[in-house]
């Protein structure tokens, strides 16, 4: 039960995280104009990964896409790549984790397969979250560097008469969305990995020894069976937890939820 809850919660947290990573990647407010020097500006600039926008106090907003690839800073390209890789890995992870969910039955999929898929999706979520956090952090670092560089030469005067105020940019909402979303995806991935441990069949835990009355051989039965003697009228070895509903020599098409202790 705890395993199913952990897996389900991990899936939901990762889903929210990936939705957040997608939202952050699409958002225009990765960097916003610093209003410290001029809080009542009539023109407000903000930039995203894909376009830059200008909002005028008149109510008009104009956005322009970055229609060049080669002309863009390498750091921006790197951030774009990290965010896209994060989204792709996250999306694949979500797809894999849907089939790995314990509460969903697909054909005759064994728990070991589900455990592997859960682990795979968990790792994908962790890498996806790390990509998002790395992308946002690289962009934030770029902003901090540029901020202090522009502060150093904020006013470039012409003989002290005319001032050209350089626009400084600070952290936009998308950065915070990205950090939180990346964190959530990472946490979701860790939860999936934890759930995987609980799902995996631990074959070394119990060895069931079956003693037959004839004494011809000793059969070692892997799985969660407890040893039971074959003496007396009860020649069939019953399993411990299912009240004798199914016997050892019945064919099991897939493991039941009672099979593991």
């Amino acid at each position: 039960m705890a395993v199913t809850a952990c897996q389900g919660l991990g899936f939901v947290v990762s889903l929210i995280g990936i939705a957040g990573i997608i939202a952050a990647t699409c958002m225009d407010q990765w960097s916003t104009q610093d209003l410290y020097n001029n809080p009542v500006t009539a023109v407000f600039n903000y930039q995203g990964l894909w376009r830059s926008c200008v909002r005028e106090s008149s109510g008009f907003t104009e956005c322009r896409g970055y229609f060049t690839l080669l002309g863009l800073p390498a750091m921006l390209q790197a951030v774009r790549a990290l965010m896209i890789v994060g989204i792709v890995l996250g999306a694949i992870g979500l797809l894999v984790s849907i089939f790995a969910l314990k509460c969903i039955r697909i054909g005759s999929m064994e728990d070991s397969a589900k455990a592997n898929m859960t682990l795979t999706s968990g790792i994908m979520f962790i890498v996806s979250g790390l990509c998002a956090i790395a992308g946002v952090s690289v962009f934030a670092n770029m902003l901090v560097t540029n901020f202090w560089m522009s502060t150093a030469n904020m006013y470039t005067g012409m003989g002290g008469m005319v001032q050209t105020v350089q626009t400084r940019y600070t952290f936009g909402a998308a950065l915070f969305v990205g950090w939180v979303a990346g964190g959530l995806t990472l946490i979701g991935g860790v939860m999936m990995c934890i759930a995987c441990r609980g799902l995996a069949p631990e074959e070394t835990n119990y060895k069931a020894v079956s003693y037959h009355a004839s004494g011809h051989s000793v059969a070692y039965k892997p799985g969660g069976f407890k040893a039971s003697t074959g003496f007396g009228s009860n020649t069939k070895n019953k399993k411990i937890y299912d009240g004798g509903a199914r016997t050892e020599d019945e064919v099991q098409s897939y493991p039941s939820k009672h099979d593991y202790v």
């Epitope: 009539a42 926008c53 008149s58 109510g59 008009f60």
Partner: antibody
Amino acid sequence: EVQLVESGGDLVKPGGSLKLSCAASGFTFSSYGMSWVRQTPDKRLEWVATISGGGSYTYYLDSVKGRFTISRDIAKNTLYLQMSSLKSEDTAMYFCARQSRGNAMDYWGQGTSVTVSS
Amino acid sequence: DIVMTQSPSSLTVTAGEKVTMSCKSSQSLLNSGNQKNYLTWYQQKPGQPPKLLIYWASTRESGVPDRFTGSGSGTDFTLTISSVQAEDLAVYYCQNDYSYPLTFGAGTKLELK
């Protein structure tokens, strides 16, 4: 057709109050920033105040801050300028104007005259 | 506050003549975000409210004759009337639309000889 009609101008004593109105028609009122601009007797233009489309942001000339209040009633398509503690230097023709691209004022009313004198 | 300085204060011209008037700002009106200059030109005829001619320093408002041309960038701007007509006699104001308070120049009065 875009129309802006100001009203409420009057002769008032220093320290008095006055409320100017500007009835707007012919455009989506809530989509545009609106401003009050005054023209002094020596024909100088002076921006007074601006309110954003939704009414969330207001901007004022320093000399009128705390004395004048710009507001808008979206339902009535009307812009207001509440003026209090009036001074003789507030004497002017007051125009309401619609802000457009580039923050430029593309439509102006005919103006309403405010005279502050004892 | 950004100070707008217009020159000359008045111009006496003959019909058909080319006219240029200047406007200088104490700070750059160029916005780095969209590379546009937030400078506006208005025309005001006696007894009328100002009329928008040019915004973004060089973009002509719809309905404005193409004899009116705005140019310049940063802090120095110019309004040019390629061939003055009688109906162009008015006062021309430039305005800072980049930073509050929005400030106007004192105006350039265009008169006929």
